[in-house]
């Protein structure tokens, strides 16, 4: 499973969960919830540490009768990290036990490094649109964890759904459109 493997198409569907309206005039970040995924595939590139893969993903966002016209693009961090200082101990036949004993007390994980917020717009069947703000992963990194560290890396499977946020300006206009946020 090499870093320079060829591209695999990857897409899944996100179904955001609505919540209470808010009069905030900015799009707020959502806090918790679950997502639904389907039709997955991945695309690798080689910009991080050995074993830590940035898999490019695309996902269509869907909310009831509304869906995104284009998929959202982000990275999924995957794979085990073998940082360069550890590699010689792992590769050399005589050093195998040293690597594994070291690994028993600590491990390296491929986790999210950078994110950015991005606006997405869903096209609804009635012709209206809905706007969401979502946080997408844009870079991965290797992070060292001790054995008792129970924290798991944040990836697309644990991302939160949309929280609808109706702009007060929009309510005054009696617009059919609504604003939401998700992270």
């Amino acid at each position: 499973f090499k870093n320079d493997a060829t591209e695999i198409l990857y897409s899944h569907v996100v179904k955001p969960v609505p919540a209470h309206p808010s009069s905030n005039s900015t799009l707020n970040q959502a806090r918790n919830g679950g997502r639904h995924f389907s039709n997955t595939g991945l695309d690798r590139n080689t910009r991080v540490q050995v074993g830590c893969r940035e898999l490019r993903s695309t996902k269509y966002i869907s909310d009831g009768q509304c869906t995104s016209i284009s998929p959202l693009k982000e990275l999924v961090c995957a794979g085990e990290c073998l940082p360069l200082p550890v590699l010689p101990n792992w590769i050399g036949g005589g050093y195998g036990t040293k690597y594994w004993s070291r690994r028993s007390s600590q491990e390296w994980r491929c986790v999210n490094d950078k994110t950015r917020t991005q606006r997405i717009q869903l096209q609804c069947q009635d012709g209206s649109t809905r706007t969401y703000k979502i946080t997408v992963v844009t870079a991965c990194k290797c992070k060292r964890y001790t054995r008792q560290h129970n924290e798991s890396s944040h990836n697309f499977e644990s991302m939160s759904p949309a929280k609808p946020v109706q702009h007060h300006r929009e309510r005054k206009r009696a617009s059919k459109s609504s604003k939401h946020s998700m992270s």
Epitope: N45, S70, L72, E74, Q118, G127, T138, A139
Partner: antibody, heavy 119, light 110 residues
Framework: QVQLMESGPGLVQPSETLSLTCTVS????????VHWVRQPPGKGLEWMGV???????DYNSALKSRLSIRRDTSKNQVFLKMNSLQSEDTNTYYC?????????????WGQGVMVTVSS | QVMLTQPKSVSTSLESTVKLSCKLN????????IHWYQQHEGRSPTTMIY?????PDGVPDRFSGSIDSSSNSAFLTINNVQTEDEAIYFC?????????FGGGTKLTVL
């Protein structure tokens, strides 16, 4: 078919306000975003602001203090107002249809209106 | 601040192949959509490529778009360059929801 047409004065006095109208046909303002983009003679493109499909607006931070964009959906029109014009605001002003985000490329451009700021 | 950087000018010969670049200064370009516009002198821009590599109806298949993560750049490739391809080419994306343009590349056909 889809069309966007800008209209407004070709000449504006310094310190005065520019008012441009973009009249669209072939699509609904509630289903697409409409952007304003300008271009100085012989230079690159500068995004000015957008009226999103849901009626919200965003502006270029450098122009925000003197720019406003609004729409009249019943007339299929989008309006741009920019005050305190100076000679560097001499530009061709384009009204542009943008697709929905993410992606949201500019698929149709108006013919542009050349605005000269001069006394 | 997210920026797209393009070379100011590129010269190429008739019927050759030319590759115009658009470099993103931050993040991973694979998480952005890149679009390309052509503008002839005195005319409005028109879309040549959208969504990284998609061609609108009516654009010749001599034009193609691609993304290269290793250089964090997008490319517009024109095969079998014709005299009518002489124009300025702009790349375009979004920083969050704010549109950003490259400075434009003036393509001269010799």
């Amino acid at each position: 078919q889809v069309q966007l047409m800008e209209s407004g004065p070709g000449l504006v006095q310094p310190s005065e306000t520019l008012s441009l109208t973009c009249t669209v046909s072939g699509f609904s303002l509630t289903s697409y975003n409409v952007h304003w983009v300008r271009q100085p003679p012989g230079k690159g493109l500068e995004w000015m602001g957008v009226l999103w499909s849901d009626g919200d607006t965003d502006y270029n931070s450098a122009l925000k203090s003197r720019l406003s964009i609004r729409r009249d959906t019943s007339k299929n029109q989008v309006f741009l107002k920019m005050n305190s014009l100076q000679s560097e605001d001499t530009n061709t002003y384009y009204c542009v249809r943008g697709g929905l985000l993410p992606g949201g490329y500019f698929d149709y451009w108006g013919q542009g209106v050349m605005v000269t700021v001069s006394s | 601040q997210v920026m797209l950087t393009q070379p100011k000018s590129v010269s190429t010969s008739l019927e050759s192949t030319v590759k115009l670049s658009c470099k993103l200064n931050s993040d991973n370009i694979g998480t952005y959509y890149i679009h390309w516009y052509q503008q002839h002198e005195g005319r409005s821009p028109t879309t040549m490529i959208y969504g990284d590599d998609k061609r609108p109806d009516g654009v010749p298949d001599r034009f193609s778009g691609s993304i290269d993560s290793s250089s964090n750049s997008a490319f517009l490739t024109i095969n079998n360059v014709q005299t009518e391809d002489e124009a300025i080419y702009f790349c375009h994306s979004y920083d969050d929801h704010i549109p950003i343009f490259g400075g434009g590349t003036k393509l001269t056909v010799l």
